[in-house]
């Protein structure tokens, strides 16, 4: 089977500061030099793009400056971090990997990571 398998954790809990990190690992059927990684959010049957980055193997993963994602790559493994999450952002986050160059192209889609975000309780006013 020449399909590309993508693995990611089933569940991740965001920190109290709204930061969630997870690893996206792919089993490459070919020797890609250019890879695109996209984080998608699936809510009901709607899929939206959270962030995307293209990188050359051996180089760092670079998201756009205004992206809520950051990441690092090591071989066939990508460490992804999503920031600025709030409770309403709880949902399924899918890692999508595309081997862009050289041909042939391969698509790999993970099963998704359920990210739970809990908004921190506001600090009570203290009387001094």
């Amino acid at each position: 089977c020449k399909a590309m398998h993508v693995a990611q954790p089933a569940v991740v809990l965001a920190s109290s500061r709204g930061i969630a990190s997870f690893v996206c690992e792919y089993a490459s059927p070919g020797k890609a030099t250019e890879v695109r990684v996209t984080v998608l959010r699936q809510a009901d049957s709607q899929v939206t793009e959270v962030c995307a980055a293209t990188y050359m193997m051996g180089n760092e993963l670079t998201f756009l400056d205004d992206s809520i994602c950051t990441g690092t790559s090591s071989g066939n493994q990508v460490n992804l971090t999503i920031q600025g999450l709030r409770a309403m952002d709880t949902g399924l986050y899918i890692c999508k990997v595309e081997l862009m160059y050289p041909p042939p192209y391969y698509l790999g889609i993970g099963n998704g990571t359920q990210i739970y975000v809990i908004d921190p309780e506001p600090c009570p006013d203290s009387d001094f």
């Epitope: 089977c1 399909a3 250019e34 695109r36 793009e49 999508k96 862009m100 192209y105 391969y106 698509l107």
Partner: antibody
Framework: QVQLVESGGGVVQPGRSLRLSCAAS????????VHWVRQAPGKGLEWVAV????????FYADSVKGRFTISRDNSKNTLFLQMNSLRAEDTAVYYC???????????WGQGTMVTVSS | EIVLTQSPGTLSLSPGERATLSCRAS???????LAWYQQKPGQAPRLLIY???SRATGIPDRFSGSGSGTDFTLTISRLEPEDFAVYYC?????????FGQGTKVEIK
């Protein structure tokens, strides 16, 4: 609403050229790969070419490699297919198609007919 | 190149009957990357099923997809008059993107 509208088809002699266009609207064009798929009269669907995202990555079917060139102008939300050295077997309806986030071809244009005949 | 072979070529059925369409791949295809499309005369194809079994937006639940490896199936539980059309399977996990030759579902 989300749509793709092809134009540029017509009747052309073998060996000549034609340029197809596809105008996209209703979605963030540069977030998607866009394909050309063709269908000869009374036949099935045949994938022709794809161009990804910012336009630097392109793939072609063997049947059109070296003759057809796919390109895109993200500032104008437009896809192109430059077809050179046309042959009778290139006669088909050409569809512009969006590859959805999960890979399947989720939005299709209405198609434009290309007839190669002397 | 992954070759997809659909059977039967033509399926003659009456409204209300169940339709079972087959798509066989020349090599294993991950179910995540198998789609089904419907095409009516003079119209563009329309996505019905992606990921082998997920219905596209707005597709009625009488359409269902199943299968894995090299064998995939599209089932229409009860044929409605508007379901008589040509159906194509497709793999989109690697280039070149390939389609089956199509199955025509016609009124008996």
């Amino acid at each position: 609403q989300v749509q793709l509208v092809e134009s540029g088809g017509g009747v052309v002699q073998p060996g000549r050229s034609l340029r197809l266009s596809c105008a996209a609207s209703g979605f963030t064009f540069n977030s998607y790969g866009v394909h050309w798929v063709r269908q000869a009269p009374g036949k099935g669907l045949e994938w022709v070419a794809v161009i990804w995202y910012e336009g630097s990555n392109k793939f072609y079917a063997d049947s059109v490699k070296g003759r057809f060139t796919i390109s895109r102008d993200n500032s104008k939300n437009t896809l192109f297919l430059q077809m050179n050295s046309l042959r009778a077997e290139d006669t088909a309806v050409y569809y512009c198609v969006r590859a959805g986030y999960l890979g399947a071809f989720d939005i299709w244009g209405q198609g434009t007919m290309v007839t190669v005949s002397s | 190149e992954i070759v997809l072979t659909q059977s039967p070529g033509t399926l003659s059925l009456s409204p209300g009957e169940r339709a079972t369409l087959s798509c066989r791949a020349s090599q294993s295809v991950s179910s995540s990357y198998l789609a089904w499309y419907q095409q009516k005369p003079g119209q563009a194809p329309r996505l019905l099923i992606y990921g082998a079994s997920s219905r596209a937006t707005g597709i009625p639940d009488r359409f269902s997809g199943s299968g894995s490896g090299t064998d995939f199936t599209l089932t229409i539980s009860r044929l409605e008059p508007e379901d008589f059309a040509v159906y194509y399977c497709q793999q989109y996990g690697s280039s070149p993107w390939t389609f089956g030759q199509g199955t025509k579902v016609e009124i008996k």
